[in-house]
């Protein structure tokens, strides 16, 4: 049975040019973690595999940067960044679990950050 | 470099037994997924089977589940396939290959030929 | 099982040309679809991994594209080591599958 959760930072914006971390969290299972892969709207962001580290879509080497962590960090934002990411857990033995996070990416320089982690 | 060298291959009646081999170079064996994979003559290619680094996940095609049986030795750096009751359909190039990330399957021996025939 | 469909089955084209390949899939597999190149007596050789990166060493007029279920290889402008034979395969659910490929003939 999958007893996991996952916490991410939810709802979060941020400024044109910019840079934002996207945190995901998985809670309350003994599940070992294998890989987590980062994913915008059907494309591939990044991979992190327990064995084999950190890798970044050709596409994305520019603009994405490993970490904290198993999370991501987007640099240089453009409006076109705005939209859903999914962070997909692969676990043994308990499977997948996937977080989501909405981010806006803002003209102005007004940008709230979500509540679950405070992004310095 | 990496390097995967694939043996085992040869002729077999129906109904009889072959193990493959897949001896790996060039990497850390222990830290990659691999596959077998096989293109029977003049034909496209077919996965057979799969497992995860640490054996701890297999899969199979359902053609050859209960049959052959995939497995690993990381300490040997060498993957096998164990093939039973054979059929002349199972006649075919058998390649294995490395899958990182377990997405894509970036290296590929360059196969062994297995032919059931009587 | 996702069934993987390729077209054309062959295609004939002269050096230089702009060549596009299509596979669809039975079912949404997001970006899970790589490309391979195999000629031959040869074992395949990856081109494109998930949708559209690039395989290190590929040359650069190969190019993949989509997500879902429909998804494109293009090759710029055809060399004549190019002439092969090309196979989709979508790595999204187990069991994985392949399209049934194709073959880039010399017109």
């Known amino acids: 049975m999958m007893t996991g959760t996952i916490e991410t930072t939810g709802n979060i914006s941020a400024e044109k040019g910019g840079s934002i971390i996207l945190q995901c969290h998985l809670s309350s299972t003994t599940a070992q973690v294998t890989q987590v892969n980062w994913e915008q709207q059907d494309q591939l962001l990044a991979i992190c595999n327990a064995d084999l580290g950190w890798h970044i879509s050709p596409s994305f080497k520019d603009r994405v940067a490993p970490g904290p962590g198993l999370g991501l960090t987007l640099q240089s934002l453009t409006v076109n960044d705005t939209g859903e990411y999914f962070c997909i857990y692969h676990t043994y033995p308990d499977g997948t679990y996937t977080g989501r996070i909405f981010l806006e990416v803002l003209e102005s320089s007004v940008a709230e950050h979500g509540a679950r982690f405070q992004i310095p | 470099e990496v390097q995967l060298l694939e043996s085992g291959g040869g002729l077999v009646q129906p109904g009889g037994s072959l193990r493959l081999s897949c001896a790996a170079s060039?990497?850390?064996?222990?830290?990659?997924?691999m596959s077998w994979v096989r293109q029977a003559p003049g034909k496209g290619l077919e996965w057979v089977a799969d497992?995860?680094?640490?054996?701890?996940?297999?899969g199979y095609a359902d053609s050859v589940k209960g049959r052959f049986t995939i497995s690993r030795d990381n300490s040997k750096n060498t993957l096998y396939l164990q093939m039973n009751s054979l059929r002349a359909e199972d006649t075919a190039v058998y390649y294995c290959a490395r899958e990182p990330y377990d997405v894509w399957m970036d290296y590929w021996g360059q196969g062994t030929l297995v032919t059931v025939s009587s | 099982d996702i069934q993987m469909t390729q077209s054309p089955s062959s295609l004939s084209a002269s050096v230089g040309d702009r060549v596009t390949i299509t596979c669809r899939a039975s079912?949404?597999?997001?970006?899970?679809l790589n490309w391979y190149q195999q000629k031959p007596g040869k074992a395949p050789k990856l081109l494109i991994y998930?949708?559209?990166s690039l395989q290190s060493g590929v040359p650069s007029r190969f190019s993949g594209s989509g997500s879902g279920t429909d998804f494109t290889l293009t090759i710029s402008s055809l060399q004549p080591e190019d002439f092969a034979t090309y196979y989709c395969?979508?790595?999204?659910?187990?069991?994985?599958?392949f399209g049934g490929g194709t073959k880039v003939e010399i017109k």
């Open positions: 060039g990497f850390t064996f222990s830290s990659y997924s």
């Open positions: 497992i995860s680094s640490s054996a701890s996940t297999i």
């Open positions: 395969q979508q790595s999204y659910s187990t069991p994985l599958t």
């Open positions: 079912q949404s597999i997001s970006y899970y």
């Open positions: 998930a949708a559209s």
